[in-house]
C-alpha cells in the first residue's frame, strides 16, 4: 500500500508532586516502521527513561504506538516528541495545561 503519515498526539497527566507524565501517541500510519522518542533539549532521552508501547494494528489497515516519559513540572518546553516515518520527521511539543495537541505530519 501507499505510505500514510501518522497523526501525532501529545498529552500530559499528573504523575506525582512536581512531576508529570508526557505521552506521545502516533496513529493511523503505514507502513508499521516508525521512530518515536522523547527528546530533552533536542537530544534523545536514553531508552531506560522512556516507556514504549508495541506497534499494533488499529483495525483500519494502519498502525498505532506510543512513548511516554516522566518529567519535572515547569520544564515542559525543554521536551519534544520526535517522530520519524518513511523518511519524514517532525517534532511535537508538550501542550501547556491539560490541552491536547493533534496534527497530521504532512510530506
Amino acid at each position: 500500500g501507499s505510505t500514510v503519515p501518522p497523526m501525532v498526539n501529545v498529552t500530559r497527566s499528573e504523575a506525582s508532586e512536581g512531576n508529570i507524565t508526557v505521552t506521545c501517541r502516533a496513529s493511523g500510519f503505514y507502513p508499521w516502521n516508525i521512530t518515536l522518542s522523547w527528546r530533552q533539549d533536542g537530544v534523545s532521552l536514553s531508552h531506560d527513561t522512556q516507556q514504549w508501547g508495541d506497534v499494533l494494528p488499529d483495525g483500519n489497515g494502519t498502525y498505532q504506538t506510543w512513548v511516554a516519559t516522566r518529567i519535572c513540572q515547569g520544564e515542559e518546553q525543554r521536551f519534544t516528541c520526535y517522530m520519524e516515518h518513511s523518511g519524514n520527521h517532525s517534532t511535537h511539543p508538550v501542550p501547556s495545561g491539560n490541552s491536547h495537541h493533534h496534527h497530521h505530519h504532512h510530506h
Epitope: Q40, G42, V43, L45, D48, T49, T91
Partner: antibody
Framework: DVHLVESGGGLVQPGGSRKLSCAAS????????MNWVRQAPEKGLEWVAY????????YYADTVKGRFTISRDNPKNTLFLQMTSLRSEDTAMYYC????????????WGQGTLVTVSA | QIVLTQSPAFKSSSLGERVTMTCTAS???????LHWYQQKPGSSPKLWIY???NLASGVPARFSGSGSGTSYSLTISTMEAEDAATYYC?????????FGSGTKVEIK
C-alpha cells in the same frame, strides 16, 4: 557571567589514565546538559561525550566508548571526564561545553585543557 | 553515524564579497538539530547560528543560515575582516553527535 574552567590536562603515557574536571559558575549547573568536545592540534572539532542534567542520558563518540566516562557532581557544579587506555590520537585540547536548553547546541565553551599522550 | 561534509575546505575572499559555504549530511537530519560555530586561531569556538537559521547573540546580521534535509549552508552577505575564521557545522539529530571538518575563510 557563565564561566567554565577545565583542569587536569598534561602529559600522559600511552595506556595511562587521566581525569579532567570542569568547574562551572554563573548558571544553575544542575539544570543544563554538558559535553566534552576535543580538538587535536591543527585539526577540527570532535564531540566526545554528552551528559544530561540528571545524569540519566549519556552518549559517547565511538572513538572513546568503553575508555572514557563522563560524569557530574551537581552540588559541586563540576563536570568530569575520566579517560583510560589513552592513545596518541587522544592528544587534543579538551573543551567543556554547556548544552543550550530547548534548542540544543554548545552555547558556552571553556578555554580548554591540553592532554598530550606520548612516551 | 551521520557524516557532515563541508565545502569548500578553504575560501579566500575579498572584503565586501558574498561568501557561501555548505554542509552536506550523509542522511537527512531535522533542521532543528543543525548548528554552526565560528572559531578563530587560539580561541575557543563560539555558537554562531543555531537551529539552521537563527543567529546567536551578538552575531552580525550579514550572516545567515538555511537548509533542510541533507543540505545546509552559511552565507556572509558582505565579507568583513573580522569574519576571517573557521566555521564548523554540527548535528545532534542522532548520536553520536558529529561536526563537519570545517571551512576556513581568509581575507584575499
Amino acid at each position: 557571567d557563565v564561566h567554565l574552567v577545565e583542569s587536569g590536562g598534561g602529559l600522559v603515557q600511552p595506556g595511562g589514565s587521566r581525569k579532567l574536571s570542569c568547574a562551572a559558575s554563573g548558571f544553575t549547573f544542575n539544570t543544563f546538559g554538558m559535553n566534552w568536545v576535543r580538538q587535536a592540534p591543527e585539526k577540527g572539532l570532535e564531540w566526545v561525550a554528552y551528559i544530561n542534567s540528571g545524569s540519566n542520558t549519556i552518549y559517547y563518540a565511538d572513538t572513546v566508548k568503553g575508555r572514557f566516562t563522563i560524569s557530574r557532581d551537581n552540588p559541586k557544579n563540576t563536570l568530569f571526564l575520566q579517560m583510560t587506555s589513552l592513545r596518541s590520537e587522544d592528544t587534543a585540547m579538551y573543551y567543556c561545553t554547556r548544552w543550550e536548553p530547548v534548542t540544543g547546541g554548545f552555547s558556552y565553551w571553556g578555554q580548554g585543557t591540553l592532554v598530550t599522550v606520548s612516551a | 553515524q551521520i557524516v557532515l561534509t563541508q565545502s569548500p575546505a578553504f575560501k579566500s575572499s575579498s572584503l565586501g564579497e558574498r561568501v557561501t559555504m555548505t554542509c552536506t549530511a550523509s542522511s537527512s537530519i531535522s533542521s532543528s538539530y543543525l548548528h554552526w560555530y565560528q572559531q578563530k586561531p587560539g580561541s575557543s569556538p563560539k555558537l554562531w547560528i543555531y537551529t539552521t537559521s537563527n543567529l546567536a547573540s551578538g552575531v552580525p546580521a550579514r550572516f545567515s543560515g538555511s537548509g533542510s534535509g541533507t543540505s545546509y549552508s552559511l552565507t556572509i552577505s558582505t565579507m568583513e575582516a573580522e569574519d576571517a575564521a573557521t566555521y564548523y557545522c554540527h548535528q545532534h539529530h542522532r548520536s553520536p553527535f558529529t561536526f563537519g571538518s570545517g571551512t576556513k575563510v581568509e581575507i584575499k
